[in-house]
C-alpha cells in the first residue's frame, strides 16, 4: 500500500490523543535506555510503511502485535485517513482468522514496540533532518 | 462465533437523525474494536467510526461533529448516532467487530440501509 495520499495530520492527532498512551501502556515496566533504535525512516509515508510493517508483520521472536490496542487504534487510523486502505485489510483479515496466535509479551516484542515508539516519533517530525 | 445484527436503518429527511444499533451475540471479548462501515453505490466501503474497548472513538472527517458512536457492554450492543444527514450520507451501513483473532475487523453484520432524501 502506498501511504502518500494519507490525511498525515489526522493520523498524528490520532496518535498524540490515545495511540502513544497504549505504546507506554505496554512498554511499563521498561527502562526508556534499554533499546537501540535501529529503524529509521525518511518521511510521512515511508514512516507508516515501517510502523505497518513492524506492527502488523509477524517476526522472529515476537509472534504478533496485532491485537494490542495500540496496532487496533492504528491500523482504523490508517482506514480512516488513507484512501483505500480499508479494502485492502477486510480482505487480508480472512487470511488472518486462520492463523490465530497465543498472545505472549516477549523482550523481542519489547524491543520491537521500542521501535515503533521511535518511528511515530519521526512521523510527528517530518521537518526534521534525518540523523 | 459471533453473531451481529443492525438495525435503525430508513428513510429520514435532510438535517434528519437516525439511531443504528449493533447487537453482538456469541463469544464476546473483553479487548474489542467496533465499528461502522458504510457503503455507497459504486463506492469503496469506508470505515467512517470506531470505538475501543477502553472506550476511545475514532472518526472520518466526514461525520466528524454529527455523528456519535458509542457502546454498552452490557448489552455487548453498539450504537451510532447520526444526526444533521445530508443526502451523501445515503449508504448500506454495516457494524463490524474484531480484535479476537486478527485484531481487525473479524465478524461483520448484514448490513442496514439509510436513505437521506426529501
Known amino acids: 500500500y502506498d501511504f502518500t495520499n494519507c490525511d498525515f495530520e489526522k493520523i498524528k492527532a490520532a496518535y498524540l490523543s490515545t495511540i502513544s498512551k497504549d505504546l507506554i501502556t505496554y512498554m511499563s515496566g521498561t527502562k526508556s535506555t534499554e533499546f537501540n533504535n535501529t529503524v529509521s525512516c525518511s518521511n510521512r509515508p515511508h514512516c507508516l510503511t515501517e510502523i505497518q510493517s513492524l506492527t502488523f508483520n509477524p517476526t522472529a521472536g515476537c509472534a504478533s502485535l496485532a491485537k494490542e490496542m495500540f496496532a487496533m487504534k492504528t491500523k482504523a487510523a490508517l482506514a480512516i485517513w488513507c484512501p483505500g486502505y480499508s479494502e485492502t485489510q477486510i480482505n487480508a483479515t480472512q487470511a488472518m482468522k486462520k492463523r490465530r496466535k497465543r498472545k505472549v509479551t516477549t523482550n523481542k516484542c519489547l524491543e520491537q514496540v521500542s521501535q515503533l515508539q521511535g518511528l511515530w516519533r519521526r512521523f510527528n517530525r517530518p521537518l526534521l533532518k534525518q540523523q | 462465533e459471533v453473531q451481529l445484527v443492525e438495525s435503525g436503518g430508513g428513510l429520514v429527511q435532510p438535517g434528519g437523525s437516525l439511531r443504528l444499533s449493533c447487537a453482538a451475540s456469541?463469544?464476546?471479548?473483553?479487548?474489542?474494536?467496533m465499528g461502522w462501515f458504510r457503503q455507497a453505490p459504486g463506492k469503496e466501503r469506508e470505515l467512517v467510526s470506531a470505538i475501543f474497548s477502553d472506550g476511545s472513538t475514532l472518526y472520518a472527517d466526514s461525520v466528524k461533529g454529527r455523528f456519535t458512536i458509542s457502546a454498552d457492554n452490557s448489552k455487548n450492543t453498539a450504537y451510532l448516532q447520526m444526526n444533521s444527514l445530508k443526502p451523501e450520507d445515503t449508504a448500506v451501513y454495516y457494524c463490524?467487530?474484531?480484535?479476537?483473532?486478527?485484531?481487525?475487523?473479524?465478524?461483520w453484520g448484514q448490513g442496514t440501509l439509510v436513505t437521506v432524501s426529501s
Open positions: 463490524a467487530k474484531g480484535g479476537y483473532s486478527s485484531g481487525w475487523f473479524d465478524y
Open positions: 456469541g463469544n464476546i471479548f473483553s479487548r474489542y474494536i
